[in-house]
Interface confidence: medium
């Protein structure tokens, strides 16, 4: 066989022509349009991409590959069938018509064709393997892409909801800010009004103060005049008393005795027949030294010596050690009787202490101690109390055991701080303890949240400053 060539016919079939001597053999084979030639194989992207491929594009490519694979399979089957059919026919014809040497040629041609078929089959198997490989890779990629897509969708949804939340919050805050701005403007206006009112008040007060200062000057002048008159009167009274005692002593010796009687406390005054509330002159025990005190002859049977009173804030109780020792203030109003007198008195016999309290809401309460005395000045007038009863708290608001007395210039408390300076007034401070009846006097509506006010913790709590207080003593056997 001299010649073997391949060409295409008009209807697109592959044409195999074999020339052997005077005989020529032509085989017509079907050709698949979509079959990719081996010279241009499909090569996918070699590098993995971070960004997902277009989903539809991947699906299309996969479908194309599936179609190609299916077509190849069909083509292969057709080719096999076709060769088998033609071979059968050709072989019969050859056997009938051909001479012996042509039979040999035909066998050779058949062998060649079979070899070619085998080669084609192998190539198709390779293509099929490649397609499968590619399909698997694409499936994996698709899976990755769909996962990535889901993740992105979730993230987008989360971010969207977050944005919505932030927008809501933002609008809420904007409203709040606007409301605050409005409020601020209103407040500023009211503050300005208050300021104007205060300025008016201040100017009024200034003029009142000026008037008061003038009145004080006048009163001071009047006072000195009155004091001189009082002094003159006292001298006259003393002279009269002297004259009377001189003339009466001879006639009635008992009168002289009565005139010499002095009272140690208000209980003695009461027992002597004076049962009216008021200021009486008391005498220090074992001494001729005198002191003026207010006696309550009505409350709880009378005979009470008032040792402290607060009622209107008219007297400053932030005083020195010496002032608390000797006493200060006005016995008919706010005053402190004096630690020295009380100490001496309460060491003579057993005394009870009653503390009467009033709040700003019209309530009253008391604490009664069945035994009370003060130590001497050497022991800083330490307070000693026993047996508490009453309505102003079940626990004593004067710390037990008693503490030393402290003043602004005599720091004897149990604190590293200076309670008297901090809380103002002289008192039996602990550190600083639950009471201080000598604290700052605060008027109504300013009397709460004040830790330096007039305090009795176990009745009104820590920050409440009382309206009025009275401390009174009386012999236990009265």
């Amino acid at each position: 066989y001299n010649n073997f060539r391949k060409s295409m016919d008009s209807i697109g079939k592959k044409q195999y022509q074999v020339q052997h001597g005077s005989c020529s053999y032509t085989f017509l084979l079907p050709e698949m349009d979509n079959c990719r030639s081996s010279s241009s194989p499909y090569v996918s992207n070699a590098v993995q991409r971070d960004a997902p491929l277009e989903y539809d594009d991947s699906v299309q490519r996969l479908q194309v590959l599936e179609n190609i694979m299916e077509n190849n399979t069909q083509w292969l089957m057709k080719l096999e069938n076709y060769i088998q059919d033609n071979m059968k026919k050709e072989m019969v014809e050859i056997q009938q018509n051909a001479v012996q040497n042509q039979t040999a040629v035909m066998i050779e041609i058949g062998t060649n064709l079979l070899n070619q078929t085998a080669e084609q089959t192998r190539k198709l198997t390779d293509v099929e393997a490649q397609v499968l490989n590619q399909t698997t890779r694409l499936e994996l990629q698709l899976l990755e892409h769909s996962l990535s897509t889901n993740k992105l969708e979730k993230q987008i949804l989360d971010q969207t909801s977050e944005i919505n939340k932030l927008q809501d919050k933002n609008s809420f805050l904007e409203k709040k800010v606007l409301a605050m701005e409005d409020k601020h403007i209103i407040q500023l206006q009211s503050i300005k009004e208050e300021k104007d009112q205060l300025q008016v008040l201040v100017s009024k007060q200034n003029s009142i103060i000026e008037e008061l200062e003038k009145k004080i000057v006048t009163a001071t002048v009047n006072n000195s005049v009155l004091q001189k008159q009082q002094h003159d009167l006292m001298e006259t009274v003393n002279n009269l008393l002297t004259m009377m005692s001189t003339s009466n002593s001879a006639k009635d010796p008992t009168v002289a005795k009565e005139e010499q009687i002095s009272f140690r406390d208000c209980a003695e005054v009461f027992k002597s027949g004076h049962t009216t509330n008021g200021i009486y002159t008391l005498t220090f025990p074992n001494s001729t030294e005198e002191i003026k005190a207010y006696c309550d002859m009505e409350a709880g049977g009378g005979g009470w010596t008032i040792i402290q009173r607060r009622e209107d804030g008219s007297v400053d109780f932030q005083r020195t050690w010496k002032e608390y020792k000797v006493g200060f203030g006005n016995p008919s109003g706010e005053y402190w009787l004096g630690n020295e007198f009380v100490s001496q008195l309460t060491n003579q016999q057993r005394y009870v202490l009653k503390i009467h309290l009033k709040d700003w809401e019209g309530n009253e309460a008391y604490s009664l101690y069945e035994h009370f005395y003060l130590s001497s000045e050497e022991l800083n007038y330490r307070i000693h109390l026993k047996g508490l009863t009453g309505t102003a708290g079940k626990i004593s608001s004067i710390s037990q055991p008693g503490n030393d007395f402290s003043t602004k210039d005599g720091d004897n408390d149990k604190c590293i701080c200076k309670c008297s300076q901090m809380l103002t007034g002289g008192w039996w401070f602990d550190a600083c303890g639950p009471s201080n009846l000598n604290g700052m006097y605060y008027p109504q509506r300013q009397n709460t949240n004040k830790f330096n006010g007039i305090k009795w913790y176990y009745w009104k709590g820590s920050g409440y400053s009382l309206k009025a207080t009275t401390m009174m003593i009386r012999p236990a056997d009265f």
Epitope: C415, C417, C432, F451, N452
Partner: antibody, heavy 123, light 112 residues
Framework: QVQLVQSGAEVKKPGASVKVSCKAS????????MHWVRQAPGQRLEWMGW????????KYSQKFQGRVTITRDTSASTAYMELSGLRSEDTAVYYC????????????????WGQGTMVTVSS | DIVMTQSPLSLPVTPGEPASISCRSS???????????LDWYLQKPGQSPQLLIY???NRASGVPDRFTGSGSATDFTLRISRVEAEDVGVYYC?????????FGGGTKVEIK
Amino acid sequence: QVQLVQSGAEVKKPGASVKVSCKASGYTFTSYAMHWVRQAPGQRLEWMGWINAGNGNTKYSQKFQGRVTITRDTSASTAYMELSGLRSEDTAVYYCARGVDDYGGNSWAFDIWGQGTMVTVSS
Amino acid sequence: DIVMTQSPLSLPVTPGEPASISCRSSQSLLHSNGYNYLDWYLQKPGQSPQLLIYLGSNRASGVPDRFTGSGSATDFTLRISRVEAEDVGVYYCMQALQTPLTFGGGTKVEIK
């Protein structure tokens, strides 16, 4: 004189509890609030809570809420601080301190301090 | 919680020279009763803290008058007019206005 004496150093394992005592003397124990403050190595002082020794009322820092318990025994004039669920970061010196106040627990200073108790938490 | 910020962190001083420590709070410590609820403590090496100044400007008993506390609302200062060797240690400010009571980070004063 007024003083606070604390119990000795402790070594504890994580998850355990520790109870530190603070004995008061020289003053009326029930008239004051007792505070507990701790100091981890190289750290600032940290307030843990307080007890009103008179009525037993307590207040704790939110940080220690649920883990700290402050109690007192008035007959022994002693305050106690118990910290549970110990962690390594609880390693610190624990102080008790007497509160100076307007009475009612609103302390405005700590005037007396204990000598401190070292608590080490280690596995 | 009220945050307390102290400066400087460290303060090298010369004996006899003045020294100043600053303390700032995240909100006003001025109480309605007129007092600033701020205290200063000194923790000497190996010791417990000790109270120096209470309620902004009140010197504790036994504290030398070379220590002065000043300031109001959110800004406070502790001044030592003439530093002495015994003044070394860590100084802490503490707010007592509301619980939890909180301390500053401390200022370490040491001799140069």
